[in-house]
């Protein structure tokens, strides 16, 4: 059995292990700390530049986090014989700023990820599924976790980074699997309306802390196991009748609307009635509008049609510039 | 929220084997491992062995020459038996369980069953 | 194996007074240390994993800190309720082992 190594037990060890050799199975690598007990290897706060060669076989779990990897290339995690205990791998923190196509290949029992905290200029589309195939093979994960992954903007590439993550999410088909996924706080101006009907074993969603105005164009209804819905602290106005009547349909959600800017006008007046007689909206009472001014603060479930109108249009020849 | 409960008899006599079994309720089998561990009277708590759910079993070395632990999957049940009791095996035991594959997964048994007092006496 | 000894063995303090828990490790644990708390007739409660980290739904006046050997609990102010029996717990190695225990009683 291995005990909880640091750099200086296996440093020297490393030394001789820089071969294809496999790895012995109590071996830790430098800078790491591991538990074979606790199938756990730790490489946190190292500044570790890529991934090491040489993790210990028995490895459930493997924090990489707070470190400077820069690229994740293909098969970075492949190794021979494979990590095939690997079950949740934390790279949060780690100035990520590539994730290549097949980064996560040759994983077979990786059910969680946990990419937050890095600021991915790029995402292959295929960093998830492995392979350019229409329909790959399904990708064993089960949580995804990609909070705040949006690069600053001078590191941006020409295509929307709404785009680019969405094109990695439903490569292949490979995340039909996926029960969670977060992406809050990635400043998403809208939610490209392909993603969720590629992700139909959602059961928990957490798209709060960006800026989405509307989800007009998201469809939610072959989201049947959804459970929880987090859209708090984004930009949202209104919710329109169809995707009110969608989230009612889900038969097991709770939806979180926490802290956006309803404006509560004419437009609010149908999902005014849907608060007040559904039961999927969690902390409904705390709900208020932010605008028009004179309905500052005003408490949605409090409203009534009186209180919902629209400022007549004016005809052309009376409108001011 | 995973829950267990454990049985088996709990007044044996000197030379007998001890067997008691945990149910699991609520919960998928993978991702635990499943572990066993006794309280004597008025003393601590000392840690018996575990099995995973593919059957891979770790054992306490004062006590692998007569203890076996095995699962069943297809019930969600794992066992304990423990050969030639002896008094110094009175103890309460407890099954436990720890899931090792969460964010914030625990290293400690994060689970544990009601308890089994188990006495040994002629 | 891997032997935790825990100080002092018995503890008396007031509610509302600040309990500081020990425990030593024979040889490194790195962070892989946990700590329980059991009542009479009750199984142990997870307080603390990884060392440092809260289980779910513990308060927040219970905090744990340490690496390597050495490692404290700390109860903040102690409530009515947290009179009873710690334990630490490594798994770092097998076999896993426990420390004897240190008993919280009201003074």
């Known amino acids: 059995t291995s005990s909880a190594s640091s750099s200086s037990s296996s440093a020297p060890f490393l030394a001789s292990a820089a071969s294809a050799q496999p790895p012995l199975p109590d071996q830790c690598p430098a800078l790491c700390e591991c538990s074979e007990a606790a199938r756990t290897v730790k490489c946190v706060n190292r500044n570790l530049t890529e991934v090491p060669t040489d993790l210990p076989l028995y490895v459930r779990n493997l924090f990489l986090t707070g470190n400077q990897l820069a690229v994740l290339p293909a098969g970075a995690f492949a190794r021979r014989p494979p990590l095939a205990e690997l079950a949740a791998l934390n790279l949060s923190g780690s100035r990520l700023d590539e994730v290549r196509g097949g980064a996560f290949e040759h994983l077979p029992s990786l059910r969680q990820l946990d990419l937050s905290h890095n600021p991915l200029a790029y995402l292959s589309p295929f960093a998830f599924s492995g392979s350019n195939a229409s329909i790959s093979a399904p990708s064993p994960l089960v949580e995804l976790i990609l909070n705040h992954i949006v690069p600053p903007d001078d590191k941006r590439q020409n295509r929307s980074f709404e785009g680019m993550v969405a094109a990695a999410l439903v490569a292949g088909r490979a995340l039909q699997g996926l029960h969670l996924l977060e992406l809050a706080s990635n400043h998403f101006l809208y939610l490209p309306r392909d993603v969720l009907a590629q992700l139909p074993s959602l059961r928990y969603l957490d798209l709060s802390n960006n800026s989405l105005v509307s989800l007009t164009y998201v469809s939610f209804r072959n989201l049947t196991h959804l459970e929880s819905l987090h859209l708090e602290d984004n930009a949202l106005k209104v919710l329109h009748n169809g995707t009110l009547a969608e989230l009612q349909g889900l038969p097991h959600v709770r939806v979180f609307l926490d802290n956006n800017p309803w404006v509560c006008d004419c437009h609010m007046a149908d999902m005014v009635t849907w608060l007040k007689q559904t039961g999927v909206v969690q902390g409904k009472d705390r709900l208020t509008c932010a605008f028009p001014e004179k309905m500052r603060n005003r408490v949605l479930l409090e409203l009534n049609s009186a209180d919902l109108d629209c400022d007549p249009i004016l005809p052309p020849s009376l409108q001011t510039s | 929220q995973v829950q267990l409960q454990q049985w088996g008899a709990g007044l044996l006599k000197p030379s007998e084997t001890l067997s008691l079994t945990c149910a699991v309720y609520g919960g998928s089998f993978s991702g635990y491992y499943w572990s066993w561990i006794r309280q004597p009277p008025g003393k601590g708590l000392e840690w018996i062995g575990e099995i995973d759910h593919s059957g891979s079993t770790n054992y306490n070395p004062s006590l692998k020459s007569r203890v076996t632990i095995s699962v069943d999957t297809s019930k969600n049940q794992f066992s304990l038996k423990l050969s030639s009791v002896t008094a110094a095996d009175t103890a309460v035991y407890y099954c436990?369980?720890?899931?090792?594959?969460?964010?914030?997964?625990?290293?400690?048994?994060?689970?544990w069953g009601q308890g089994t007092t188990v006495t040994v006496s002629s | 194996e891997i032997v935790l000894t825990q100080s002092p063995a018995t503890l008396s303090l007031s509610p509302g007074e600040r309990a500081t828990l020990s425990c030593r490790a024979s040889q490194s644990v790195s962070s892989f240390l946990a700590w329980y708390q059991q009542k009479p007739g009750q199984a142990p409660r997870l307080l603390i994993y990884d060392a440092s980290n809260r289980a779910t739904g513990i308060p927040a006046r219970f905090s744990g800190s340490g690496s390597g050997t050495d490692f404290t609990l700390t109860i903040s102010s102690l409530e009515p309720e947290d009179f009873a029996v710690y334990y630490c717990?490594?798994?770092?190695?097998?076999?896993?082992?426990f420390g004897q225990g240190t008993r919280l009683e009201i003074k």
């Open positions: 436990a369980a720890w899931f090792g594959e969460l964010w914030d997964y625990y290293y400690g048994m994060d689970v």
């Open positions: 717990q490594q798994r770092s190695n097998w076999p896993l082992t």
